[in-house]
């Protein structure tokens, strides 16, 4: 490429989290080049003997790819020319967590940036009224979490109240023996109130809200990844 080694290009990464068993994205962008054949992308993982992924001369070069990533990686080939070096990682594993390096060579120079990739399991909770219970009870369920999260209940009417004495949370290991189903039950619920079930670990925070009135039940839930500079 005629690179002297004195020139450096800007490479930018974004810390992110992967949901085990699903596909993930390791984000990386760089100053684009006009010729695809002049661009080399290398993804490396700290402490791993082989490469995570290599893309050069317009195609994947996987002869030195590490066994743990075999068949699980892809770049967005049509977006490389515009400076997107992001890596798609299929079927994220718990052991994919760690520090990654996105290393770029173009005709303008070289550059690299590291990113922290966390892995775990996180899912949206659903809050329902438990009609089988003897008293007014809410049941909050989320199918997949790892590591084990904390569960906290809150109420719009009784802001700041501690519901730990009137709630019960259990964690049930799923069939793959890693993730767990989260079930939390809140007792002594009053109507005309909005209750929130908040599930959080070091990777994600999810909230399920339920508004119970005489005439209707309204639900809402959302999930936020933590420590991701999105």
């Amino acid at each position: 490429f005629g690179i002297s080694g004195r020139h450096s290009i800007t490479v930018t990464t974004v810390a992110s989290a992967g949901n085990i068993g699903e596909d993930g994205i390791l984000s990386c962008t760089f100053e684009p080049d006009i010729k695809l054949s002049d661009i080399v992308i290398q993804w490396l993982k700290e402490g791993v003997l082989g490469l995570v992924h290599e893309f050069k001369e317009g195609k994947d070069e996987l002869s030195e790819q590490d066994e743990m990533f075999r068949g699980r990686t892809a770049v967005f080939a049509d977006q490389v020319i515009v400076g997107n070096a992001s890596l798609r990682l299929k079927n994220v594993q718990l052991t994919d967590a760690g520090t990654y390096k996105c290393y770029i060579i173009t005709s303008k120079g070289k550059g690299n940036a590291n990113l922290e990739y966390k892995t775990g399991a996180f899912s949206m909770p659903e809050v329902n009224v438990d009609y089988n219970a003897s008293s007014e009870t809410l049941r909050c369920e989320a199918p997949r979490w790892f590591p084990q999260p904390t569960v906290v209940w809150a109420s719009q009417v009784d802001q700041g109240a501690n519901f730990s004495e009137v709630s019960n949370t259990s964690f049930e290991l799923n069939s793959e023996n890693v993730t767990m189903k989260v079930v939390s039950v809140l007792y002594n619920v009053t109507i005309n109130n909005t209750y929130s079930c908040m599930i959080e670990n070091d990777i994600a925070k999810a909230t399920g809200d339920i508004k119970v009135t005489e005439s209707e039940i309204k639900r809402r839930s959302h999930l936020q990844l933590l420590n991701s500079k999105a």
């Epitope: 490396l44 003997l49 082989g50 590490d66 743990m68």
Partner: antibody
Framework: EVQLLESGGGLVQPGGSLRLSCAAS????????MSWVRQAPGKGLEWVSA????????YYADSVKGRFTISRDNSKNTLYLQMNSLRAEDTAVYYC???????????????WGQGTLVTVSS | DIQLTQSPSTLSASVGDRVTITCRAS??????LAWFQQKPGKAPKLLIY???SLEGGVPSRFSGSGSGTEFTLTISSLQPDDFATYYC?????????FGQGTKVEIK
């Protein structure tokens, strides 16, 4: 100061098992791949096995595949080699060595332990 | 698997001599080659990595060259402390292999 200290060697009968340990200190253990290398008496060096920093990848020489298992406990900064179905030809001094941090960039096998002797004999 | 062949197996030399050891790989390993020095009863010591990069603290009389399948370790002026056995090692991707060793002895 980087230090690697092997233990667990000794005399074992053919077909027996042994577990070697390597206690590491002086560096961020989880950031580095680690390897085991052995040297039979009066012979050359033979790479045995390696494991990635997070433990997600393991690698073996053909001569030990299926018999030896490498593992690590990053919370204890310790590397292990479980050796099963031992043979006379496994008799050697076993060294642990710090392997790479980054593919293609860093030095490797820059620090070694003092070695532990494994003797397989009836 | 990638094989490494070192030559010569034994080398007799005198203090002040220029010594060259060759290492050939059975297939291309680019520049993924290291050189080690070992003395009796001691663990090996890294001298050269990435074919030609000198490890910190290693005297400049040691140098490495080559790429692909042919590599050399050169000691420009042999010192008394250099009499030892030298090994090349390839680390192409996730395999590692050592050469059979070259013993440098006093002539």
């Amino acid at each position: 100061e980087v230090q690697l200290l092997e233990s667990g060697g000794g005399l074992v009968q053919p077909g027996g098992s042994l577990r070697l340990s390597c206690a590491a200190s002086g560096f961020t253990f989880s950031s580095y791949a680690m390897s085991w290398v052995r040297q039979a008496p009066g012979k050359g060096l033979e790479w045995v096995s390696a494991i990635s920093g997070g433990g997600g990848s393991t690698y073996y020489a053909d001569s030990v595949k299926g018999r030896f298992t490498i593992s690590r406990d990053n919370s204890k900064n310790t590397l292990y080699l479980q050796m099963n179905s031992l043979r006379a030809e496994d008799t050697a001094v076993y060294y642990c060595a710090r392997d790479i941090q980054w593919y293609g960039e860093s030095t490797l096998f820059d620090y070694w332990g003092q070695g532990t002797l494994v003797t397989v004999s009836s | 698997d990638i094989q490494l062949t070192q030559s010569p197996s034994t080398l007799s030399a005198s203090v002040g001599d220029r010594v060259t050891i060759t290492c050939r790989a059975s297939q291309s390993i680019r520049s993924w080659l290291a050189w080690f020095q070992q003395k009796p009863g001691k663990a090996p010591k890294l001298l050269i990595y990435k074919a030609s990069s000198l490890e910190g603290g290693v005297p400049s009389r040691f140098s490495g060259s080559g790429s692909g399948t042919e590599f050399t370790l050169t000691i420009s002026s042999l010192q008394p402390d250099d009499f030892a056995t030298y090994y090349c090692q390839q680390y192409n991707s996730y395999s590692r292999t050592f050469g059979q060793g070259t013993k440098v002895e006093i002539k």
